[in-house]
């Protein structure tokens, strides 16, 4: 029950996270004009990954796409790539995790297969979240380094005086959406990986024993060895009990003093 809940919650959290990553990638407000020194401005500039926008005092907003690839900085291209990779991985992860959900029955799918799919989707969500966080962080770093760089001239109009104003850009809403969304996707992925451990088939004890008859008075001690799934420690059919019961490897060994009465 706890495993199903963890898996389901992980799926929902990742779903919200990936939706957030998509939203952040599409948003125009990755960088916004810093209004610290000029809170009442007639023009408000902001940029996204795909277009640059201007909101004018009358309420009119104009956005222009970046119709060039070569004219854009490599960092911006890298951010675009990271966000797209994050979305693609997240989308594949969601698709895989739907089939991996314990509450959904698809044919006669083994629990081990569901466990593997859960782990796969979990890893995909983790990488997707990391891509989004990395992309947003790279953009944020680019903003910080360019904070004082971008300048523009503005005429005040009265008497035609020229006033040089620095158009500085600060963090936009999309950055915060991206960070939160990336974090949620990451958390969802971790939850899926945790759920995977619970979904894996548990170790089963079999009372199977191999022994040889060495006389009519064999002191037989029932024992056994574990048939392991690989998750346990007894993976090499080690002898569990001493006595007449032997592991497969010991069948042709020399008789011990305990074999005869």
């Amino acid at each position: 029950m706890a495993v199903t809940a963890c898996q389901g919650l992980g799926f929902v959290v990742s779903l919200i996270g990936i939706a957030g990553i998509i939203a952040a990638t599409c948003m125009d407000q990755w960088s916004t004009q810093d209004l610290y020194n000029n809170p009442v401005t007639a023009v408000f500039n902001y940029q996204g990954l795909w277009r640059s926008c201007v909101r004018e005092s009358s309420g009119f907003t104009e956005c222009r796409g970046y119709f060039t690839l070569l004219g854009l900085p490599a960092m911006l291209q890298a951010v675009r790539a990271l966000m797209i990779v994050g979305i693609v991985l997240g989308a594949i992860g969601l698709l895989v995790s739907i089939f991996a959900l314990k509450c959904i029955r698809i044919g006669s799918m083994e629990d081990s297969a569901k466990a593997n799919m859960t782990l796969t989707s979990g890893i995909m969500f983790i990488v997707s979240g990391l891509c989004a966080i990395a992309g947003v962080s790279v953009f944020a770093n680019m903003l910080v380094t360019n904070f004082w760089m971008s300048t523009a001239n503005m005429y005040t109009g009265m008497g035609g005086m020229v006033q040089t104003v620095q158009t500085r850009y600060t963090f936009g809403a999309a950055l915060f959406v991206g960070w939160v969304a990336g974090g949620l996707t990451l958390i969802g992925g971790v939850m899926m990986c945790i759920a995977c451990r619970g979904l894996a088939p548990e170790e089963t004890n079999y009372k199977a024993v191999s022994y040889h008859a060495s006389g009519h008075s064999v002191a037989y001690k029932p024992g056994g060895f574990k048939a392991s799934t690989g998750f346990g420690s007894n993976t090499k059919n080690k002898k569990i009990y001493d006595g007449g019961a032997r592991t497969e490897d010991e069948v042709q060994s020399y008789p011990s003093k305990h074999d005869y009465v």
Partner: nanobody, 123 residues
Framework: QVQLVESGGDLVQAGGSLRLSCAAS????????MGWHRQAPGKQRELVAM???????NYADSVKGRFTLSRENTKNTVHLQMNKLKPEDTAVYYC?????????????????WGQGTHVTVSS
Amino acid sequence: QVQLVESGGDLVQAGGSLRLSCAASGSPFGFVVMGWHRQAPGKQRELVAMLTSSGTTNYADSVKGRFTLSRENTKNTVHLQMNKLKPEDTAVYYCRAVLRSGSDWRAAANEYWGQGTHVTVSS
């Protein structure tokens, strides 16, 4: 440096016509909005007409049907055709433009004002 150069202001009789022009020099990358504002003596500056890059034109209620704002496609130039002028249209007319400063992705748009041209309508 971008500058707005206005022309066409004059003294005109009531009921007459006048054409104001505003040209943005200094080869700006493109306009977001361009238009005209006016300031009558002792009054606040008000919007007369505004043209957006999407082609929408807005007019003040007091000038609707009398004034027409047009743009030259080849240049960042706007013309305000003023017909049936009234004495209350007397004011200093200022050209205002929001222009993009370049094609670079970080290029900001800024607001620019002209120095103003006087329009006097006598009764």
